[in-house]
Interface confidence: low
């Protein structure tokens, strides 16, 4: 593996070469963690402490802000409860989603009293509207956590908010909720560690199963404590959970509870020299690469190790067909003298738990009509026995010999002279961004990773907690506790002044145009353009 970056740029070098624009935060704010990209309006909305920002995608120095603090009473209540006045007793924005054409929906911790509201953004970008609906505040329980330290994953579709969060002051009652909309709120089973066991939610995504929207599923990515017997000692497992979009809860024991919730373990590991696999279990971030077929996005996951002794990070790729295969496989069941987890061998009730009510797979019209045996089975068998293994059964990127860990990932699919390449932008806990290209070898999923760039994007080392990529603007946006940074996806001119250097870089964004290393456009009919991503061979492509 080529672990030395082709380019390593310090913050100073990034500034001097005009390759980074930074918003260094406001004195009375912090925690620029919640991002919402709006390519149509050319805005990046950012939720932070007591503020929501609207940044211009062209240049983040141009921004509008909404101040949304908590009342003195709320702040005092929070303080009396023994919380930190600066780090906890404020309104940390945790949810920021597009509600409709004219409004966003935002939720914050509200000084341990979660609160939500709508933000008016107008019909058109030129309306230049960005204001809080002061008259319409809603209870944020089950939408935002009480504690700003806790992670939340949310998704707003068709006026309904799906969120994975903690629903209580103590931060013990974790659940996946569906709120808003016209239906009764639905949640995962309460106080049942088989469903969720102290989870840390990462993200939520809507993925179609078929051409019938009734089959649409919401997938949650999270990490959680492994259940006793599943693993010796205390361990973390990365998970993917599924819920049918048209799940309206069941009857009796699952009234207002999900009936189609299932979860499976995501494996990201490398074989060790002693025959014991090294597991990267701490899922940190997920990116879905939608290309051609929206039903089958490629899932990119960023993982770190749980161990304090051995620190490492990895990126694993998963296919949705593998995920679906696992959800159609055996359920995990506790049995035997040691009460350990085994694949369930008994009769699975019909319709199979986890199947969405629809015409496609037949059977039933609503989850409320599910037979008792399906409800009972679903309630006690939320986990699948088989895990989901990554494509090629191993990570595509591994970093173990460094003083940092991966925290975030976004991926861009780039057209190059010799094919399409996925370029990963990986954020770290020290404020650097790695730009990595995965290059297919014999088969498209057998990949070689090439580290193109390592860029420091913040003045002080600070963990990157949010990232968005704009293909339209060809820019990357990065969030941390300290502020927001913006950088171009490519810096072709920095690779050098010769064709060979440009070709050796193996950056799919760049090609030698006869006089300089510049942005490669597949549509440009230039016979002189030299680029070789697969092999990085200048001898064949450069005549100078």
């Amino acid at each position: 593996k080529n672990n030395v970056p082709r380019l390593k740029l310090s913050y100073k070098e990034m500034l001097e070469s005009n390759n980074v624009i930074t918003f260094n935060g406001l004195a009375n704010s912090s925690s620029y963690h919640t991002f919402l990209l709006d390519e149509e309006r050319s805005r990046l909305y950012v939720g932070a402490k007591d503020h929501i920002f609207s940044f211009d995608l062209v240049n983040i120095k141009d921004f509008q802000k909404i101040v949304w603090p908590v009342s003195y009473t709320r702040r005092d209540e929070c303080k009396w409860a023994g919380k930190d006045i600066l780090k906890e007793c404020a309104n940390f924005i945790k949810v920021l989603k597009a509600y409709n054409q004219t409004h966003l929906y935002a939720c914050g911790t509200g000084a341990f009293h979660p609160i939500c509201t709508y933000i008016e953004i107008g019909h058109h970008p030129e309306d230049n509207i960005f204001k809080l609906e002061n008259s319409h505040f809603e209870n944020g329980r089950g939408k935002s956590p009480y504690d700003p330290k806790l992670l939340t994953a949310s998704l707003l579709i068709d006026g309904e908010l799906y969120s994975g969060t903690a629903a209580d002051f103590m931060g013990r009652d974790f659940a996946i909720f569906r709120t808003l909309g016209h239906h009764h709120p639905i949640r995962t089973e309460q106080h049942d560690s088989r469903w969720l066991n102290d989870p840390k939610f990462i993200s939520a995504h809507l993925i179609s199963e078929s051409d019938n929207p009734e089959d649409d599923k919401v997938y949650f990515f999270f990490r959680e404590n492994a259940i006793d017997g599943e693993h010796s000692g205390k361990a973390t497992h990365a998970r993917i959970g599924q819920i049918c979009k048209n799940d309206f809860g069941g009857h009796r024991s699952l009234v207002n509870k999900w009936t189609t919730f299932l979860k499976a373990r995501l494996i990201c590991s490398v074989p060790g020299p002693n025959g014991i696999d090294t597991h990267f279990d701490e899922l940190q971030d997920v990116f879905l690469m939608n290309f051609k077929d929206p039903k089958n996005p490629v899932v990119y996951g960023v993982f770190t190790t749980s161990s304090n002794i051995f620190k490492g990070s990895a990126v694993c790729m998963y296919s949705m067909s593998d995920v679906r295969r696992v959800f159609l496989g055996p359920y995990a069941h506790r049995d035997g003298p040691n009460y350990q987890w085994v694949p369930y061998q008994g009769r699975v009730p019909y319709p199979r738990p986890g199947t969405c009510p629809s015409k496609t797979f037949g059977g039933f019209d609503s989850t409320k009509d599910l037979p008792d045996d399906v409800i009972t089975f679903a309630r006690s068998h939320p986990a699948m026995y088989n895990p989901v293994f990554p494509m090629n059964n191993r990570p595509i990127v591994i970093k173990t010999d460094v003083n940092y860990q991966f925290t975030q990932i976004v991926v861009d699919r780039v057209d190059a002279e010799d094919g399409q390449y996925d370029v990963m932008f990986i954020g770290t806990d020290v404020g650097t961004v790695l730009k990595v290209v995965s290059i297919p070898k014999e088969t498209w999923y057998d990949l070689e990773e090439v580290l193109l760039e390592e860029m420091t994007v913040f003045r002080e080392p600070t963990a990157i907690s949010a990232m968005e990529l704009s293909t339209k603007q060809q820019q990357l946006y990065i969030g941390s506790t300290a502020g927001v940074a913006q950088l171009p996806l490519h810096r072709c001119d920095i690779y050098g002044k010769a064709c060979a250097e440009c070709c050796l870089a193996r950056d799919p964004y760049c090609a030698w145009d006869g006089s300089a290393c510049s942005r490669y456009f597949p549509t440009a009919k230039r016979a002189t353009r030299a680029q070789d991503i697969r092999n990085g061979d200048p001898l064949t492509h450069c005549s100078d």
């Epitope: 209870n139 103590m170 013990r172 049942d192 560690s193 009796r252 009234v255 207002n256």
Partner: antibody, heavy 116, light 111 residues
Framework: EVQLLESGGGLVQTGGSLRLSCAAS????????MSWVRQAPGKGLEWVSW????????YYADSVKGRFTISRDNSKNTLYLQMNSLRAEDTAVYYC?????????WGQGTLVTVSS | QSVLTQPPSASGTPGQRVTISCSGS????????VSWYQQLPGTAPKLLIY???HRPSGVPDRFSGSKSGTSASLAISGLRSEDEADYYC???????????FGGGTKLTVLG
């Protein structure tokens, strides 16, 4: 048919101990959280304690914290309540109840009398 | 002193409609499901209403539950003599991490 049958109640001196049992049948015991609820003579219901289906978590009312211990044996379909340092105010009928977001089934109760 | 507040007594004549109230706070009724229990003289309590307004099978549709904000109520229509009992509301309390009951309402069927 769901059945819950409590036993182990009786007369005990202040400071003494008792162990209540609740035998469950008619449902998959290991799938459900279970609870104890008590009712002092002529008074209302008071929740005492509850336990996860797998004993993973246990919760107690402040009035019994540190004195009572809830436990279960899923292989025997039995719920227990170990009561130590008993006080006169612990005198009540103790009901075992199946938890399903609420107490959907109750036993007939067993009377515990603490005399001074 | 119960966490949930119920009137100590209520009464009605056969055929009448009676409502029993139960008030709490945002940490219990406001954000959690409410249940109602019926306790006939000398017997164990029985679940009457769960998840605010749902009836378990076997409970007559004369019994109905509703909730608004931090208050809940149980309505009994077409009152019958066999409805004479103690009625308790209950809910999970997030701040106490425990289940709380109302003090109970003794329903008397007159005449």
């Amino acid at each position: 048919e769901v059945q819950l049958l409590e036993s182990g109640g009786g007369l005990v001196q202040t400071g003494g101990s008792l162990r209540l049992s609740c035998a469950a049948s008619g449902f998959t015991f290991s799938d459900y959280a279970m609870s104890w609820v008590r009712q002092a003579p002529g008074k209302g219901l008071e929740w005492v304690s509850w336990i996860y289906y797998d004993s993973g978590s246990k919760y107690y009312a402040d009035s019994v914290k540190g004195r009572f211990t809830i436990s279960r044996d899923n292989s025997k379909n039995t719920l227990y309540l170990q009561m130590n340092s008993l006080r006169a105010e612990d005198t009540a009928v103790y009901y075992c109840a199946k938890l399903n977001g609420d107490f959907d089934y109750w036993g007939q109760g067993t009377l515990v009398t603490v005399s001074s | 002193q119960s966490v949930l507040t119920q009137p100590p007594s209520a009464s009605g004549t056969p055929g009448q409609r009676v409502t029993i109230s139960c008030s709490g706070s945002s940490s219990n009724i406001g954000n959690n499901d409410v249940s109602w229990y019926q306790q006939l003289p000398g017997t164990a309590p029985k679940l009457l209403i769960y998840a605010d307004s749902h009836r378990p099978s076997g409970v007559p549709d004369r019994f109905s539950g509703s909730k608004s904000g931090t208050s809940a109520s149980l309505a009994i229509s077409g009152l019958r003599s066999e409805d004479e009992a103690d009625y308790y509301c209950g809910a999970w309390d997030s701040s106490l991490s425990g289940y709380v009951f109302g003090g109970g309402t003794k329903l008397t069927v007159l005449g």
